[in-house]
């Protein structure tokens, strides 16, 4: 059988190294050897591939080496496959070396900010030594912030007369570390060089970008003062490296700027004690280069009726995210504040908050929340300076079986009945939403019975027991992940009811 016709011929010119062609099929059933015929010097000369017999057999690749590689040039390539039965030739393929030239990557030697020019980095590199001198090179510059996985790209060309191998990358974030890598290719080539070694540079620092500001309103104290916990953080989109030297806060009752009070702090939280009126609060951050724009918050009067517009809320889990969605009756509300914190018996140690705009959903990566912990999630509608009533829900990113089962006791033991009472498992040990409780009970040497009840039931009366019999019993609390048994208790049914016994005695 003749060999298969060589097809899918693909050639690449590694500048000043070799000209290599590959083809299919890569393997033949019987021993096959290949001859690659080339014309070069614009068709003036011809030769065959100089691969020796030891590597040519069943090897669908061949390289032509200097000095017969001339550039610029047009080549033709034809592959002949031969076995014991004969020869099969490929079609003749045509190759313009400029279009298939691959060169070495450039070498970035500096990425620096230019004094006084904001949000810009100047990249300087060395043009690859192995690149045609007269060639215009095209470049792709890839860059990303140091903590991001997402690369951005910019393309540009440099004429061969441009000995100045520099590029000014603008519209960056201030005071941010960027990773850069560069590749190049002759302008006409379809093959890019590899990427250069990565180099890091940092843009110049600026005055702080801005703040996101929020509050937690606490119940009024006996003297009528209201504690308001203010909290702020770098605005979304602020440079990662941005550091504030401090924060200035000023606040006053609405329409009474004479009563302005100011506070300076280096913390990102501050507790104010306000009267019952409406207050306005302002916060700026500052560094050695200046102040951020002002963040503003209106604290409503104690008796102010807040609007309500969230009608429903759902929390659902995807593979790696928790997604909270809500429905609103107010189409004009397009900003929302989301709060989340662990639902623990004590004061929550971690309290988080985030603004959401132009969406009615909020997403958080599961790994930002602790598994087996219940989180309280509240969403506040924000309409201009007014904050509406929150809507709250609870969620686990991962449920487990409870760490402990319910503590159980047997009450009102009768001849054939008993009332079982158990306590709710402490929040810290639930590890999930308690779906139901199952009571397992068994007479001495008898069959085990079970009864499952809803999670809102903490007491159950067992009936149809056998008189004067020892029973063992335990209650299991179950989450979606499974159940955990409480401690086993024992009781013995009476031989005669207390009620009957007293009646008899009375006579």
């Amino acid at each position: 059988v003749l060999p298969a016709k060589p097809e899918n011929i693909s050639c690449i010119f590694y500048y000043e190294e070799n000209f290599t062609c590959t083809w299919s099929p890569e393997k033949e059933a019987s021993y096959t050897w290949y001859k690659v015929k080339r014309t070069y010097s614009y068709g003036y000369k011809s030769d065959i591939c100089s691969t020796d017999n030891s590597t040519r057999g069943n090897h669908a690749s061949c390289s032509f080496l200097p000095p017969t590689i001339t550039n610029p040039d047009n080549y033709t390539i034809q592959v002949e496959a031969q076995n014991a039965d004969g020869i099969m030739k490929s079609d003749i393929t045509y190759w313009n070396l400029d279009a298939i030239m691959k060169i070495e990557p450039p070498e970035i030697f500096s990425v620096k900010s230019v004094l006084g020019i904001k949000r810009m980095l100047q990249i300087k590199w060395i043009r690859p030594v192995l690149a045609p001198h007269s060639s215009t090179l095209k470049y792709t510059l890839r860059f990303r912030t140091i903590n991001s996985a997402y690369w951005m790209e910019v393309n540009f060309t440099k004429e061969d007369i441009d000995r100045d191998e520099t590029y000014n990358l603008t519209e960056l974030q201030a005071f941010t570390e960027y990773v850069m890598t560069l590749r190049c290719a002759p302008a006409e080539s379809m093959f890019w060089s590899g990427w250069s070694q990565e180099k890091v540079g940092t843009t110049e620092e600026e005055a702080p970008y801005g703040l996101d500001l929020w509050r937690v309103l606490k119940p009024a104290m006996v003297d009528g003062r209201r504690p308001v916990q203010l909290m702020w953080k770098k605005a979304t989109g602020a440079p990662v490296l941005e550091k504030a030297l401090g924060y200035n806060i000023w606040y006053f009752p609405e329409n009474n700027t004479n009563l302005t009070e100011t506070v300076n702090t280096t913390n990102q939280t501050h507790e104010l004690y306000l009267g019952g009126k409406t207050y306005w609060v302002y916060v700026v951050s500052y560094n050695s280069l200046g102040e951020s724009p002002v963040a503003t918050l209106r604290i409503p009067a104690l008796n102010e009726k807040t609007f309500q517009c969230i009608e429903a809320m759902q929390a659902c889990l995807t593979q790696d995210q928790l997604v909270v969605e809500w429905q609103s009756s107010a189409p004009e509300v397009d900003t929302w504040m989301v709060e989340w914190f662990p639902d623990v018996d004590s004061e929550p140690s971690s309290f988080s908050w985030e603004s959401v705009s132009q969406a009615r959903n909020w997403t958080i990566q599961k790994d930002e929340l602790k598994p087996l912990w219940c989180y309280n999630i509240s969403v506040y509608p924000v309409l201009r300076d007014r904050v509406g009533q929150p809507y709250s829900t609870q969620a686990y990113v991962q449920e487990g079986i409870p760490s402990a089962g319910p503590v159980t006791q047997a009450d009102s033991i009768g001849v054939k009945t008993v009332t079982i009472t158990w306590k709710e498992i402490p929040k810290s040990k639930r590890n999930g939403f308690i779906k139901n409780y199952t009571i397992f009970y068994q007479a001495e040497d008898g069959k085990e019975f079970s009864k499952t009840v809803n999670s809102n039931i903490l007491q159950y009366r067992l009936e149809s027991l056998t008189r004067r019999t020892s029973y063992s019993l335990q209650v299991m609390a179950s989450t979606n992940a499974g159940g955990t048994n409480g401690t086993k208790i024992n009781f013995k049914t009476l031989s005669i009811s207390h009620h009957h016994h007293h009646h008899h005695h009375h006579h």
Partner: antibody, heavy 116, light 112 residues
Framework: EVQLVESGGGLVQPGRSMKLSCVAS????????MAWVRQAPTKGLEWVAS????????YYRDSVKGRFTISRDNAKSTLYLQMDSLRSEDTATYYC??????????WGQGVMVTVS | QFTLTQPKSVSGSLRSTITIPCERS????????VSWYQQHLGRPPINVIY?????PSEVSDRFSGSIDSSSNSASLTITNLQMDDEADYFC???????????FGGGTKLTVL
């Protein structure tokens, strides 16, 4: 339409010089290798000389090396053959030919050179 | 340096098939391409086969080329001979030793 038109031939005495020209049209002259091929009366074709696209590389058959010079003017789309120290065995029709990718794809009508 | 040897003449009757061989004196015939040219009296040559067996689009499919490594020769075959096929035929290849093209001596084809 591709055209190659030779000129400059005629009768010349042995030992003297002659310069042939070939004006090309209908294609981008600077993209192609060019050649001179001759044919003595009633004889076969014989390659004389070739020149690369930019003129940097020239190639000659042994019998004319040192006597003949092939050159080109890409601005004028013209190929030249300067023939010095002519011999009687150089008598032939001289064809200007274009090297295509795999063969001589266009030929001029030829110009007669008689060395006598 | 190699030579390409062709028979001085070949003849064939009208509508018959003829084959003109072109033998390479040294080196593998398959290592460089062979082209064939037809030349009518007083006219410049025209290419009829290139790259061993390829035919320019304007040339009749009665013309075909082949390579035979066992005899180290190329062949031009013309089927269904026509009167207009009467001409001189030259094979040509590239010789890396002289860094230039080499022509065979030519074969005169007579159509009877």
């Amino acid at each position: 339409e591709v055209q190659l038109v030779e000129s400059g031939g005629g009768l010349v005495q042995p030992g003297r010089s002659m310069k042939l020209s070939c004006v090309a049209s209908g294609f981008t002259f600077s993209n192609y290798y060019m050649a001179w091929v001759r044919q003595a009366p009633t004889k076969g074709l014989e390659w004389v000389a070739s020149i690369s696209t930019g003129g940097g590389n020239t190639y000659y058959r042994d019998s004319v090396k040192g006597r003949f010079t092939i050159s080109r003017d890409n601005a004028k789309s013209t190929l030249y053959l300067q023939m010095d120290s002519l011999r009687s065995e150089d008598t032939a029709t001289y064809y200007c030919a274009r090297h295509g990718t795999l063969y001589f794809d266009y030929w001029g009508q030829g110009v007669m050179v008689t060395v006598s | 340096q190699f030579t390409l040897t062709q028979p001085k003449s070949v003849s064939g009757s009208l509508r018959s098939t003829i084959t003109i061989p072109c033998e390479r004196s040294s080196g593998d015939i398959g290592n460089t391409y062979v082209s064939w040219y037809q030349q009518h009296l007083g006219r410049p040559p025209i290419n009829v086969i290139y790259a061993d067996d390829q035919r320019p689009s304007e040339v009749s499919d009665r013309f075909s080329g082949s390579i035979d490594s066992s005899s180290n020769s190329a062949s031009l075959t013309i089927t269904n001979l026509q009167m207009d096929d009467e001409a001189d035929y030259f094979c040509q290849s590239y010789d890396s030793n002289i860094d230039g093209p080499v022509f065979g001596g030519g074969t005169k084809l007579t159509v009877l």
